[in-house]
């Protein structure tokens, strides 16, 4: 795939990685999280234009087959390509602990 | 993260696999894939509500953001969870090749 | 910017208890738990336990159980380090520090408090 | 309890050399490891988290790597304002602990 970092739409327009700060509160998880009570939550937002970080075959094919049936077939979409483990500290039934999630943290963005 | 299968907007309307058939010309392979001149192009389409096969909890943070900013954070997206490969009969300087394609054709579907 | 401001020094009987306060600032102080962390003269750092200034929900090290209490006191911003019983060896410069953050960053401290237990 | 074995005790350079620190874990902590800078009389500070992150204001020359249970803090260039002990720290569970220490001296 051509993984094309320029986007035809103008700076910022395409997918990225953004960051988005969020409470507890925001995220549903107050009930169960202690700390920390803000996160930096990194995601990944932004259009997929022809060519732009294709993430594989499937991607090309889904933007030629969405130019041709554009309502049946959608664009790709920009989701993470990668993750960034983060620390939450948690009530437990013993007590409290430190506990890693892999899967919580965008790290880089492509298109699928 | 809870995988509901069950599609809250009715039969058929969430992120699932879909087959697309595709010449060819339509996948724009036209100059360099000999074999097969058609393609079942299994793919993912659909909406993702709330808990509608979420990948992970970075799919549950971006539906909560998304509720709260719907204008900043879209809501997940539809995309394969896996591949199935694919053979294609090619062109190449010395002759034909059979060539195997790991990431051209969805197998599975989450939300992301 | 985000601090971390100690108690002064403190000379106590062996038996007696030592209160530290760690007053926060810069930042919102429910966001995140504070660490206190002692160092004795010459000797490296030892942890001695957690508490989230949200909930008051502690950690503390097993060897200090029992002996240490960590409170918060959300309307000035402050957490307090009790230690009873004290010994010759609680003798060190406590710390306090925030975090851990999401990367598991303890990252801002206070400036320390000397703590001197002697007959 | 999440042991952290920190090598060398002591090592005695000069300024522009290149020193590297190294810190072992009796087991997996990836990636929750810091580097602290502590001099005389002062709180420690914050160089590197998540075992390769440079703090922000902290100066490139520090940098750190590793993964699993083997982690390493290198100082490309020592400069003067480097002559301190250094410790790691495990923030992967509690108890929270760290490494004995590194002392860097003035050769």
């Known amino acids: 795939a051509r993984n094309g970092d320029r986007c035809p739409l103008g700076p910022g327009r395409c997918c990225r990685l953004h960051t988005v700060h969020a409470s507890l509160e925001d995220l549903g998880w107050a009930d169960w999280v202690l700390s920390p009570r803000e996160v930096q939550v990194t995601m990944c937002i932004g259009a997929c234009p022809s060519q732009f970080r294709e993430a594989n075959m499937h991607a090309q094919i889904k933007m030629n087959l969405h130019r041709l049936k554009p309502d049946t077939v959608p664009a790709p979409c920009c989701v993470p390509a990668s993750y960034n483990p983060m620390v939450l500290i948690q009530k437990t039934d013993t007590g409290v602990s430190l506990q890693t999630y892999d899967d919580l943290l965008a790290k880089d963005c492509h298109c699928v | 993260a809870r995988n509901g299968d069950r599609c809250p907007l009715g039969p058929g309307r969430c992120c699932r696999l879909h087959t697309v058939h595709a010449s060819l010309e339509d996948l724009g392979w036209a100059d360099w894939v000999l074999s097969p001149r058609e393609v079942q192009v299994t793919m993912c389409i659909g909406a993702c509500p709330s808990q509608f096969r979420e990948a992970n909890m970075h799919a549950q943070i971006k539906m909560n953001l998304h509720r709260l900013k719907p204008d900043t954070v879209p809501a997940p997206c539809c995309v394969p969870a896996s591949y199935n490969p694919m053979v294609l009969i090619q062109k190449t300087d010395t002759g034909v090749s059979l060539q195997t394609y790991d990431d051209l054709l969805a197998k599975d579907c989450h939300c992301v | 910017q985000v601090q971390l401001v100690q108690s002064g020094a403190e000379v106590k009987k062996p038996g007696a208890s030592v209160k530290v306060s760690c007053k926060a600032s810069g930042y919102t102080f429910t966001s995140y738990g504070i660490n206190w962390v002692r160092q004795a003269p010459g000797q490296g750092l030892e942890w001695m336990g957690w508490?989230?200034?949200?909930?008051?929900?502690?950690n503390y090290a097993q060897k200090l159980q029992g002996r240490v209490t960590m409170t918060t006191d959300t309307s000035t911003s402050t957490a307090y380090m009790e230690l009873r019983s004290l010994r010759s060896d609680d003798t060190a410069v406590y710390y306090c520090?925030?975090?851990?953050?999401?990367?598991?960053?303890?990252?801002?401290w206070g400036q320390g408090t000397m703590v001197t237990v002697s007959s | 309890d999440i042991q952290l074995t920190q090598s060398p005790s002591s090592v005695s350079a000069s300024v522009g050399d290149r020193v590297t620190i190294t810190c072992r874990a009796s087991?997996?902590?990836?990636?929750?490891l810091a580097w602290y800078q502590q001099k005389p009389g002062k709180a420690p500070k914050l160089l590197i988290y998540a075992a390769s992150s440079l703090q922000s204001g902290v100066p490139s020359r520090f940098s750190g790597s590793g993964s699993g249970t083997d982690f390493t803090l290198t100082i490309s260039s020592l400069q003067p304002e480097d002559f301190a002990t250094y410790y790691c720290?495990?923030?992967?569970?509690?108890?929270?602990?760290f490494g004995g220490g590194t002392k860097v001296e003035i050769k």
């Open positions: 720290q495990q923030a992967n569970s509690f108890p929270i602990t």
């Open positions: 508490i989230t200034a949200y909930s008051g929900d502690t």
């Open positions: 520090a925030r975090g851990p953050g999401q990367y598991a960053d303890v990252d801002v």
């Open positions: 087991q997996g902590i990836s990636p929750w």
